[in-house]
Interface confidence: low
């Protein structure tokens, strides 16, 4: 039976994907006047050009270079916050601590956050039915290659002290297969980055363990040390209080450990 459309294992392109990307771009350039030079129509054309008419298992970083060029952005290299498996808290933090930036606070990260997209070989159609899953289908799919590309560039730009927020509730607090573990860790530049400081976020109210002693954190420390970058680690026992104290550092309850 001929199949008119390739069926992949992952969800299809987010509905209204082109409109969403364009609208997000316009909104971003309004909110960040330093990016007013960006022509959002050109950004969308470059984004589209990276995956339309291409086999969705054969996407390369090269395909995204025109988009990367248009989205070039300078963020303070010593104010970078990486995260792994704890995106929401990281974003809540940078919304309060406005001088720090996650990847999703940059134009390209903001455009693609939480979206899925893919095309079809030799047609100009966007596939709204299904897209390749990283594990079940292929790793060189449009979404995975995009995040690998922007994550690598973001890590390469970092300097001085780089912070990373890690989820202490997961079995692998540091996961070598995450974007942080497989891409960002290996693209921090030792000649620019002095220290990687991990913030391990505790999930349970009564959890008073020192998760900085977790074997996966020790593994991260080993990887980082071998790259001639210093490593430090802090437990964030009370993430709610942590955010509250970022908002109101003068609060008397914020002098104790959080």
């Amino acid at each position: 039976v001929p199949r008119w459309r390739q069926q992949w294992s992952g969800p299809g392109t987010t509905k209204r994907f082109p409109e969403t990307v364009l609208a997000r771009c316009v909104k971003y350039t309004e909110i960040h006047p330093e990016m007013r030079h960006v022509d959002c129509q050109s950004v969308w054309d470059a984004f589209k050009g990276a995956f339309i008419s291409k086999h969705p298992c054969n996407i390369t970083e090269e395909d995204y270079q025109p988009l990367m060029k248009l989205g070039t952005q300078t963020v303070p290299c010593n104010k970078i916050l990486l995260w792994s498996r704890i995106k929401d808290l990281a974003h809540q933090f940078t919304q309060v601590q406005r001088d720090m930036f996650t990847l999703e606070d940059t134009l390209l990260g903001y455009l693609a956050d939480d979206l899925t997209w893919c095309g079809e070989f030799n047609t100009s159609k966007i596939n709204y039915q299904s897209c390749p899953d990283w594990r079940k289908d292929c790793s060189n799919n449009p979404v995975s290659v995009f995040w690998k590309t922007v994550s690598r560039r973001f890590a390469e730009a970092a300097c001085d002290v780089v912070h990373v927020m890690l989820n202490g509730s997961r079995s692998k607090i540091f996961d070598k297969n995450s974007t942080f573990g497989s891409v960002e860790v290996h693209n921090l530049q030792p000649e620019k980055v002095q220290t990687l400081e991990a913030w391990v976020i505790h999930g349970g109210r009564e959890d008073s363990r020192d998760l900085c002693q977790d074997p996966t954190i020790k593994e991260l420390e080993s990887i980082i040390s071998k790259r001639n970058i210093q490593f430090s680690c802090k437990n964030i026992y009370r993430p709610d209080k942590f955010l509250q104290c970022v908002k109101n550092p003068e609060d008397s309850s914020c002098t104790s450990e959080i």
């Epitope: 364009l22 609208a23 771009c25 316009v26 909104k27 350039t29 309004e30 909110i31 006047p33 007013r36 030079h37 960006v38 022509d39 959002c40 129509q41 050109s42 070039t72």
Partner: antibody, heavy 120, light 111 residues
Framework: EVQLVESGGGLVQPGGSLRLSCAAS????????MHWVRQAPGKGLEWIAF????????YYVDKVKGRFTISRDNAKNTLYLQMTSLRAEDTAVYYC?????????????WGQGTTVTVSS | DIVLTQSPASLAVSLGERATISCRAS??????????MHWYQQKPGQPPKLLIY???NLESGIPARFSGSGSRTDFTLTISSLQAEDVAVYYC?????????FGGGTKVEIK
């Protein structure tokens, strides 16, 4: 069809206040940044204020800062300009203008304008 | 603030002839290889209308006789063959830096 219709202009004494409105139709108002631009009689154009889609970013020209307030109500598809401590030099036709879709700061649609006269 | 100086202040051109308007900025309005200079046309009793954006891009619906050129501080709007309906005041505008500023305008008339 995109339409912007200003209202609220009129004659006001120096030191007085006025609130201008701009009713938008024919497009998704909440997707566009909006501006106010004015034109004194027989003179050129002067940009005075901008408000982003969700009102999180607002910019003014220095000479109106502290006196004028730009705001918007996306539910009502309406842009506002609250003007206080009005001076004779604020006399002008006030236009609301829609921010161009793909870059900050220039305008693809304008209203017909509303006239503000500040005089004793 | 970036000051935009237009010249001439007024211009009389015969029908079918070329009209050229200059706009000079007090500092560069270029950034990332893009010129943030735009041109508007304003006819008597009407609001302005966008003609050219980012120095040389023709806004949709605008006749091809209008063109824009230039970079950094020096920009030109050209009407290749003036028509009666082109009688208007033309303004340049920069959006490279806040506050957004306009030139003083150039009045184009029929000779």
């Amino acid at each position: 069809e995109v339409q912007l219709v200003e209202s609220g202009g009129g004659l006001v004494q120096p030191g007085g206040s006025l609130r201008l409105s701009c009713a938008a139709s024919g497009f998704t108002f909440s997707d566009y940044g909006m501006h106010w631009v004015r034109q004194a009689p027989g003179k050129g154009l002067e940009w005075i204020a901008f408000i982003s889609t969700g009102s999180s970013n607002i910019y003014y020209v220095d000479k109106v800062k502290g006196r004028f307030t730009i705001s918007r109500d996306n539910a009502k598809n309406t842009l506002y300009l609250q003007m206080t401590s009005l001076r004779a030099e604020d006399t002008a036709v006030y236009y609301c203008a829609r921010n161009y879709v793909s870059s900050y700061g220039y305008f693809d649609y304008w209203g017909q304008g509303t006239t503000v006269t500040v005089s004793s | 603030d970036i000051v935009l100086t237009q010249s001439p202040a007024s211009l009389a051109v015969s029908l079918g002839e070329r009209a050229t308007i200059s706009c000079r900025a007090s500092e560069s309005v270029d950034n990332y290889g893009i010129s943030f200079m735009h041109w508007y046309q304003q006819k008597p009793g009407q609001p302005p209308k966008l003609l050219i954006y980012r120095a040389s891009n023709l806004e949709s619906g605008i006749p091809a006789r209008f063109s824009g050129s230039g970079s950094r501080t020096d920009f030109t709007l050209t009407i290749s063959s003036l028509q009666a309906e082109d009688v208007a005041v033309y303004y340049c505008q920069q959006t490279n830096k806040d506050p957004l500023t306009f030139g003083g305008g150039t009045k184009v008339e029929i000779k």
